[in-house]
Interface confidence: medium
């Protein structure tokens, strides 16, 4: 059962796992949600009736029954983890805490003009978890405007005290706002030296990498595969750090793999969602329950529905025993990972999918695409929307992409002559334009935000946001696409598609069925050669075949250039302009979305 509200002057008795310090009850609830075992918590607010050493304590709790006895206590605020809820969860915390000093290891001290600059510095520093900034009103002259970057083993403060004229806050890495470079490659036959901060068991290097990404102190990792010569170290995932944030040495070793935390581009990768099954693999851990199940998929469902289950092992039925049902062992551990991994015993293992909602919704796998053909099928491009104008009569105006539950990203040039958002309608989950009738539900547009440097499509800044009047409930047919990460400049996209209801040739009409075309990206240098009369800037990206034949066209404007990388779709471009349609040696020109991530986040995350 999902309980979101906080219980004032209430304390949960017993069930303590650990105590951390958080600046608010709201953040305590987030910490509890991200902790592998926490189901409930009690937070102590500052209060004259409470011992100041207990202020800001956040006690994380667990219970077999998923609840604990309640006791009245002034200044105590209790609640439940969001693990029991089905809604999206984010670790992003932009709050600034006034007159609070969050204690940790002060490893960097510098002068900053404002708390915002200090927070940006923390976000762009690989080690920084949170910061404290002494304002210009701070009593001690030599400490005024000092920005202290801090880290701890847990990522949360070791203590929080009241201190006048300072402000504190957290790194915004989990808000996708970091400039730190993302190295996505996993390096085979490589061991990274440097100090281990923790070790866990993992079935493969990908799970090891995801564990590293959400571990507060992990910057890179080394994973020993099941073929590693030393038996005791097989399936061991070593979480590592170094002063520079990078490995000091790479050692060539067979059967080991190494890689990096993807903390600064975690909004566009699955971090908590380990959806694979591991065949002939047994996960060991504390047993929660043993239930009969028809298949390993059914076993995973049982684990996902049991709030305390973290992973499972399924042993298929022997011949005709038990109506063909096998045994499903639901398990847990202190850190959410198996305590040991064994191979060759015939089990099928995997993880709960309950934590998938802690990843960005845009990382969810969508149904496999239909290869060949140009017409799309339902649910193939669930982020694609059709934007209609109702003036003078209703018609398709442009494409667009869902990037958040209240936000559509599209092209600025679509709004030439549009006087008011009132005449706009956004339809999502649509395959055929003919589905749109008088009574078809749509989203009204509350606000059109056009980039303030936009003049015309050909000169760039062809980007706009639509804020919807109501929120989109995500389903298989309408869900967001991930934005590319700022730190992700090394990704080379090879699987890119342009979609829309636009013309199929220059003189044509809007298509009924959503069309798709696979199109290769073209370097800006090559693109510039094809458009001598224009300036192809780094804020544009081009795509097209040299011989032409496939391209976006009139009516596709504002729609997505979607590229798949590591099973996740990214909104790489927005259909903007081109010379004719699908002409030989005339690639389509798209708005290069990665160059506008800051602008998008600034507009969509404005308080």
């Amino acid at each position: 059962e999902c309980v979101t509200q906080l219980l004032k002057d209430t304390c949960f008795e017993g069930g303590d796992i650990t105590t951390v310090f958080t600046p608010s009850a709201k953040y305590c609830q987030v910490v509890c949600t991200y902790h592998p075992r926490c189901l409930l918590f009690t937070f102590t607010a500052e209060s004259p009736s409470e011992d100041p050493t207990r202020w800001f304590t956040c006690v994380l709790k667990d219970s077999v029954t998923e609840t604990l006895p309640r006791v009245n206590r002034t200044a105590a605020i209790s609640g439940y983890s969001f693990k029991q809820c089905s809604h999206q969860i984010s670790a992003c915390n932009k709050d600034i805490y006034v007159d609070l000093d969050m204690k940790g290891i002060n490893y960097n001290s510098s002068v900053a003009k404002s708390a915002q600059e200090c927070q940006e510095r923390c976000t762009d520093d690989v080690h920084c978890h949170f910061f404290t900034y002494a304002t210009r009103q701070f009593p001690s002259l030599e400490h005024r405007n000092i920005c202290l970057l801090k880290h701890t083993q847990t990522g949360t403060p070791t203590r929080i005290t009241k201190l006048d004229k300072v402000v504190s806050g957290f790194s915004l890495k989990s808000c996708a706002l970091s400039n730190l470079a993302c190295i996505r490659d996993i390096f085979p036959n490589t061991v990274f030296a440097d100090s281990n901060i923790d070790s866990v068991m993992a079935p493969d290097a990908f799970v090891c990498g995801r564990i590293c990404t959400h571990h507060p102190g992990c910057l890179f990792f080394t994973f020993f595969s099941q073929e590693w010569p030393k038996e005791s170290q097989r399936n061991l995932c070593l979480l590592k750090t170094s002063e520079s944030g990078l490995p000091s040495t790479r050692i060539k070793k067979s059967k080991a793999l190494s890689g990096f935390s993807l903390q600064s581009c975690r909004h566009s990768i699955p971090v908590f969602c380990h959806s694979s099954f591991y065949h002939d693999t047994d996960f060991l851990g504390e047993e929660l329950d043993i239930v009969a199940a028809k298949s390993h998929e059914a076993c995973q469902k049982l684990c996902t529905n049991a709030v305390r289950c973290q992973f499972f092992t399924y042993t298929p039925a022997q011949a005709s025993c038990n109506e063909g049902k096998g045994k499903c062992y639901l398990k847990l551990s202190s850190n959410g990972s198996p305590t040991k991994i064994l191979h060759g015993r015939g089990g099928i293992s995997g993880y709960t999918l309950r934590l998938c909602k802690m990843d960005n919704e845009c990382t969810t796998k969508i149904k496999p695409r239909i290869v060949g053909g140009t017409a799309s099928v339902r649910g193939e491009w669930p982020w694609q929307v059709t934007l209609h104008t109702t003036s003078p009569t209703q018609r398709h105006l442009c494409g667009g992409s869902i990037i958040g539950n209240q936000w559509i990203l599209t092209a600025a040039h679509c709004f030439y002559g549009v006087e008011s958002p009132k005449i706009l309608r956004v339809y999502s989950g649509i395959l055929n334009q003919s589905e749109i009738k008088e009574d078809t539900s749509f989203f009204g547009v509350q606000e059109i935000i056009i980039h303030d440097q936009y003049k015309m499509a050909e000169s760039g800044y062809d980007i706009a946001l639509l804020k919807l009047e109501t929120t989109v409930n995500y389903t298989d047919s309408q869900r967001p696409i991930c934005l590319p990460s700022k730190g992700d400049r090394n990704v080379i996209y090879t699987d890119c598609w342009v979609t829309g209801w636009g013309y199929r040739k220059l003189r044509d009409k809007i298509q009924n069925t959503l069309q798709k075309a696979k199109i290769p990206l073209v370097t800006n240098e090559e693109c510039q050669k094809r458009y001598r009369g224009h300036k192809i800037t780094h804020k544009m990206i081009c795509a097209g075949y040299r011989e032409g034949g496939k391209d976006a066209c009139k009516g596709d404007s504002g729609g997505p250039l979607s590229c798949k990388h590591n099973e996740v779709w990214h909104l790489v471009g927005i259909t903007s302009w081109g010379e004719g349609c699908a002409q030989r040696e005339r690639p389509g020109v798209y708005t290069n979305v990665v160059e506008y991530v800051d602008w998008i986040l600034e507009k969509t995350q404005a308080v």
Partner: nanobody, 122 residues
Framework: QVQLVESGGGLVQPGGSLRLSCAAS????????MAWFRQAPGKGLEGVSL????????SYTDSVKGRFTISRDNSKNTLYLQMNSLRAEDTAVYYC???????????????WGQGTLVTVSS
């Protein structure tokens, strides 16, 4: 203390090549990363390429991928930027920077050279 001195800038025609060098001296082994940044007239600082000093990881910004190559000669304590197929929009003052973070943010670099001007024009 670390000192960085760039050289190799100059005037070059579109399509031409240049090789920038950055000689580092002082306490350089404390630096986790080195980078080339550039500042075009009237624009802000833009990251061009990064290199991790010990492990050699490299990253390029989109607009220079396939044209520029960053490298480092540890024995000479020198960082290089080989620039091919130069375009007018590459015109800028190029700065070499050293710091402890592998980052695109200029604020992550504590040490900077004085800059070398690259002009691409016919």
């Amino acid at each position: 203390q670390v000192q960085l001195v760039e050289s190799g800038g100059g005037l070059v025609q579109p399509g031409g090549s240049l090789r920038l060098s950055c000689a580092a001296s002082g306490y350089t082994y404390s630096m986790g990363a080195m980078a080339w940044f550039r500042q075009a007239p009237g624009k802000g600082l833009e990251g061009v390429s990064l290199i991790a000093t010990s492990s050699g990881f490299i990253s390029y910004t989109d607009s220079v991928k396939g044209r520029f190559t960053i490298s480092r000669d540890n024995s000479k304590n020198t960082l290089y930027l080989q620039m091919n197929s130069l375009r007018a929009e590459d015109t800028a003052v190029y700065y070499c920077a050293a710091g402890t973070q592998f980052s695109w943010s200029p604020g992550s670099y504590n040490y900077w050279g004085q800059g070398t001007l690259v002009t691409v024009s016919s």
